[in-house]
Amino acid sequence: GCLTQLYENAFFRGGDVASMYTPNAQYCQMRCTFHPRCLLFSFLPASSINDMEKRFGCFLKDSVTGTLPKVHRTGAVSGHSLKQCGHQISACHRDIYKGVDMRGVNFNVSKVSSVEECQKRCTSNIRCQFFSYATQTFHKAEYRNNCLLKYSPGGTPTAIKVLSNVESGFSLKPCALSEIGCHMNIFQHLAFSDVDVARVLTPDAFVCRTICTYHPNCLFFTFYTNVWKIESQRNVCLLKTSESGTPSSSTPQENTISGYSLLTCKRTLPEPCHSKIYPGVDFGGEELNVTFVKGVNVCQETCTKMIRCQFFTYSLLPEDCKEEKCKCFLRLSMDGSPTRIAYGTQGSSGYSLRLCNTGDNSVCTTKTSTRIVGGTNSSWGEWPWQVSLQVKLTAQRHLCGGSLIGHQWVLTAAHCFDGLPLQDVWRIYSGILNLSDITKDTPFSQIKEIIIHQNYKVSEGNHDIALIKLQAPLNYTEFQKPICLPSKGDTSTIYTNCWVTGWGFSKEKGEIQNILQKVNIPLVTNEECQKRYQDYKITQRMVCAGYKEGGKDACKGDSGGPLVCKHNGMWRLVGITSWGEGCARREQPGVYTKVAEYMDWILEKTQSSDGKAQMQSPA
């Protein structure tokens, strides 16, 4: 299953499959997730080690048993790959690292006014993988405001150095934010020239293209089909690059297929997995396990659930079957691709779905009247769980926020439905940033069921929570995916990085905002919060957030939206925007429904009709 916990001051001994430099543990974890063999990782922050060569070291590890012995190492951080973690799987990494220079091949330098602009330039340059920016206070005047675009053979820095007044980060192309755009076309009977960066075996050009998309240096590819004239080159997928970023030449060639990486696509990237099953095909590789199962789909599920399994072959040979079950061969290789592909067999083959980010039809959890005042504009994909609940009567207007917690589930505030309990009048917009982008053609979700907490009473602050079941499940993308829920009765976690988002009023007597706003707000203890509300009881089912001096808060139109906190690199839905005395008033924190206190209720209500819990637990 999915394991999200991080181990502080711990280092996994042995099992090394690769090492690299990464700026933090979360990026190291992401590299582990996308490495075909990596199950575990250990990261050494700069503060944890004197050896300059090992600072920022990210060590990717494999283990036949799925675990390795942990040794104590002060400052080290270890953890698990996020394979099998559904929507948490993403190659997108937005963080900017202050005081850090990520080294690589500097291929472009320009003057820019901010680190955000530098990141944007990197995202819009086809070859840029990461960048460094010298701030206005950099010690050498001639380098100030320099934006260095970089790449490296592995896509990660060749070294990371602590350097004052330098800020570094990664391209946001994996966040589907590139302005370059992409070529979706597949070119039949055409071979591209230029530099081969890798060679793998794939059953078709589409798998080849997805591998190219997620390979750090692949810009385009050529695939040799299973009827290519040279037998040893059949099913070979050549991943390619060039100085210019495009093929310098292409040659008409029977039984070849070429195309481009989709990493520069805007708004949608392919999933980093291959779900198709190939009948009459055998995939060769190292044997992991053989099991008897009923049907090829069960074989694929078995492979997906066995975390080390990369691909499988389901054999229909009479000697491999007994009764209705046949042999399911679970296999792996060094690069995640088959070492041999054979056609015209009595087998069916396919890949593990462990890197599919749609996950199952579930809401995500972890084991372990009001708008935004004083906020700033959000950017695309920053809060992909945020939805806009709109009412269409004569006109259409935004009324509340909500949080996507599963393919078919939105969590919001019960008071959003005061006086508007009819599900037909509601439209739910997901994957949007600007309300002005909504036109009559913009797709929206309709409500199948509104489930208001049974103890909620109209115009009271208690039990202000409601679930919305959507008529049809939503697909997950970089811009539309769920937020993880906290564990039941989560009281031990101290959250220090919390944000409220919404399109609500930007002042008490204001108006709905066009661009989704965000504001960083500290949590306030219930005891402190209670002192600020002389008339109202702040219960253990509520959580408060706000600044002593006011100025930043949720407001009208933000109700039902998320209060999210980042802990160990993972965002969790801590609160639902509920109520407050005015907006952003001094000494009047916002009051939010505490989601952890309602986990039993959420789990009970999101159970499917067949009794299967719709709740996936990545921890």
Epitope: E460, K531, R532, Y533, Q534, D535, Y536, K537, T539, E587
Partner: antibody
Framework: EVQLQQSGAELVKPGASVRLSCTAS????????IFWVKQRPKQGLEWIGR????????KYDPKIQGKATLTADTSSNTAYLQLSSLTSEDSAIYYC?????????WGQGTLVSVSA | DIQMTQSPSSLSTSLGGKVTITCEAS??????IAWYQHKPGKGPRLLIH???TLQSGIPSRFSGSGSGKDYSFSISNLEPEDIATYYC????????FGGGTKLEIK
Amino acid sequence: EVQLQQSGAELVKPGASVRLSCTASGFNIKDTYIFWVKQRPKQGLEWIGRIDPENDNTKYDPKIQGKATLTADTSSNTAYLQLSSLTSEDSAIYYCAKGGGLFAYWGQGTLVSVSA
Amino acid sequence: DIQMTQSPSSLSTSLGGKVTITCEASHDINNYIAWYQHKPGKGPRLLIHYTSTLQSGIPSRFSGSGSGKDYSFSISNLEPEDIATYYCLQYDNLFTFGGGTKLEIK
């Protein structure tokens, strides 16, 4: 309209116990805290304690601990103050109040007289 | 335990005039002070909380100020219905009332 109706005056003997009631209307006591405050003749106000009727959690003034017991019955929307081992020092008006962080609305008070 | 020393214990003033009552806490109470008006035969009435925030429906003739350990409460343009006993209350750590100030008209 928010109201707190307190029970009538009590004349009790030293050493005895008494139970005072505070019945709420216009709101549900589960949604608030009920506080109790004492006022001795010609003296100031003293906080006795607080109950959360939703879960019966109580908090008392450490000086009064043992003397007073707070309870609540949500079905009748009523809170109670039980005073035990009464002495002349317990002769006072006892007020119930509702609120969150503070005593926002008060009852009219119940006079308890302890006399042989 | 936080003690609240309220002064004066009584004061006499003219209608239309202004009165000021002070309360000193034994420790810093972080502005968590409230002021109540108490008339005989009734329950006290909350006037001000968090040092200076007027409870809804309370006229602006009533005001409060202070910080740390020292706080004051004022009534300007005194009216006949203001005749009552006034109490301060700290709610930073549990609850402690001041001794009260009895306000009379000359």
